[in-house]
Interface confidence: medium
């Protein structure tokens, strides 16, 4: 008796973060047995989209011509063989940018830092939002992701980074949201530059995920502070 | 979740010693700081350094380099090595993780180190 | 070196009085400072962080101002329990750095 067939690989090109209007091709791949493969979205009548396998038959095309908010949620998919329906896929979060205005990002008390040293990124928007993510440029992953406990809305969030080493600097930006939809995110913040000045010789580096934060988990969220009140955002990694 | 020091003890002046910061309910899968801070009796709080248990980078108060060493040496211990003790190094020794703006919200309940001939 | 300076050493206040203690750092530390109580043969218990925000637990009786290198905190409505020695402490420097905490102040409660 054969063991369950093997999930198949879910993937975004150009990546699952995508700008409003841009377009986005999902790739579902599986085996070369494969004879249909099936799209799912969360909280959407299954299946979302079948297609037909693209030789040499071990992976199928969903195509999205315009991103909108319709399409952006947690996808997975399945392929079928002659045996029957595969495991479903690790799940994909299609994320949209530019539903909301874009966020103001700063520093401070300045992006100009001693290695050492410490400082805050300020992610303020304009109108109450209770998510609010820090990205770095050319990092795997969101560094933090703050969210509201009780649905409570702010203006801001604070993400503090202490010690800040040479792996802190670089490009920043960040969005906002809010929590009925984690796959809704604000336009992009204008980018900050974060410039690391060594006056101790650097530590070994970790991995750009590592970034610490506050002095307490080191590449793991702690209480966002100052102005965001106690009972309001918390900190979760994505 | 909780750390707790051991390893306290009676040392000699210019002997060594090492003390274990043991935690429980967490990890350093995640990545912390740990950090060491000591009380001398009847005096204020001195801060003797922190490691980074993922990047394993360390800080150190000035007075304390060259003399003080912390290791993570398990996935749920950080020690803090010693040498050339003198009567100053008399103290209660705690271990901390780091919190939100670089403060100490878990404290251990100490380990009392006493140098003396 | 960044040091930081507390004042008054000791203070006394009748119950249902205000205290207010000041920390002073010799270079700006922006708001990355918090503040403890600690009781004879008790750890330190974290108060506020970030200068000003409270930690869960504390009661509102207790608050912090400043940023830069003045900081304040403040104990309104004295009550018994109060009685202690209260340290702030930077976290905004780790480099060069003799000592994170100010030296301390004893609260006696009248």
């Known amino acids: 008796q054969a063991g369950p067939l093997p999930k198949p690989t879910l993937w975004a090109e150009p990546g699952s973060v995508i700008s409003w209007g841009n377009s986005v091709t999902i790739w579902c791949q599986g085996t070369l047995e494969a004879r249909e493969y099936r799209l799912d979205k969360e909280e959407s009548p299954a299946p979302w989209d079948r297609q037909n396998p693209l030789e040499p038959k071990n992976k199928a095309r969903f195509s999205i011509p315009s991103m909108t908010e319709d399409y952006a949620g947690r996808y997975r998919c399945y392929y079928r063989s002659p045996v029957g329906w595969s495991q479903p896929s690790d799940p994909l979060e299609l994320v949209m940018t530019g539903a909301y205005s874009k966020p103001t990002l700063s520093a401070l008390p300045s992006p100009l830092v001693t290695s050492g040293k410490s400082v805050t990124l300020l992610c303020q928007s304009r109108s109450p939002m209770d998510t609010f993510l820090l990205i770095k440029e050319r990092a795997a992953h969101p560094l933090l992701h703050l969210r509201s406990e009780h649905g409570a809305q702010q203006h801001q969030a604070e993400f503090p980074m202490s010690p800040v080493t040479s792996v802190h600097g670089g490009t920043y930006r960040c969005f906002s949201s809010h929590g009925f939809s984690h796959y809704l995110l604000s336009h992009p913040s204008d980018p900050l530059e974060l410039i690391v000045s060594g006056s101790l010789e650097d530590p070994r580096p970790s991995p750009t995920r590592s970034v610490s934060t506050a002095a307490g988990p080191e590449d793991q969220p702690l209480m966002p502070t100052g102005s965001v009140p106690h009972s309001g955002l918390r900190r979760h990694w994505e | 979740e909780q750390s707790v020091e051991s390893g306290g003890d009676l040392v000699k002046p210019e002997g060594s010693l090492t003390l274990t910061c043991t935690v429980s309910g967490f990890s350093f899968s995640s990545s912390y700081w740990i950090c060491w801070v000591r009380q001398a009796p009847g005096k204020g709080l001195e801060w003797i350094g922190c490691i980074g248990t993922g990047s394993g980078s360390t800080y150190y108060g000035s007075w304390a380099k060259g003399r003080f060493t912390i290791s993570k040496t398990s996935s749920t211990t950080v020690t803090l090595q010693m040498t050339s003790l003198t009567a100053a190094d008399t103290a209660t020794y705690f271990c901390v993780r780091g919190a939100g703006y670089s403060s100490y919200r878990l404290w251990g309940p100490g380990t009392l180190v006493t140098i003396s001939s | 070196e960044l040091d930081m300076t507390q004042t008054p050493a000791s203070v006394s206040e009748p119950v249902g009085g205000t205290v207010t203690i000041k920390c002073q750092a010799s270079?700006?530390?922006?708001?990355?400072l918090a503040w403890y109580q600690q009781k004879p043969g008790q750890r330190p218990k974290l108060l506020i962080y970030g200068a000003s925000t409270l930690e869960s637990g504390v009661p509102s009786r207790f608050s912090g101002s400043g940023s830069g290198t003045e900081f304040t905190l403040t104990i309104s409505n004295l009550e018994c329990a109060d009685a202690a020695t209260y340290y702030c402490?930077?976290?905004?420097?780790?480099?060069?750095?003799?000592?994170?905490f100010g030296g301390g102040t004893e609260v006696v409660v009248k």
């Open positions: 402490q930077q976290g905004y420097d780790w480099d060069n750095i003799d000592n994170a």
């Open positions: 270079e700006s530390v922006s708001n990355w």
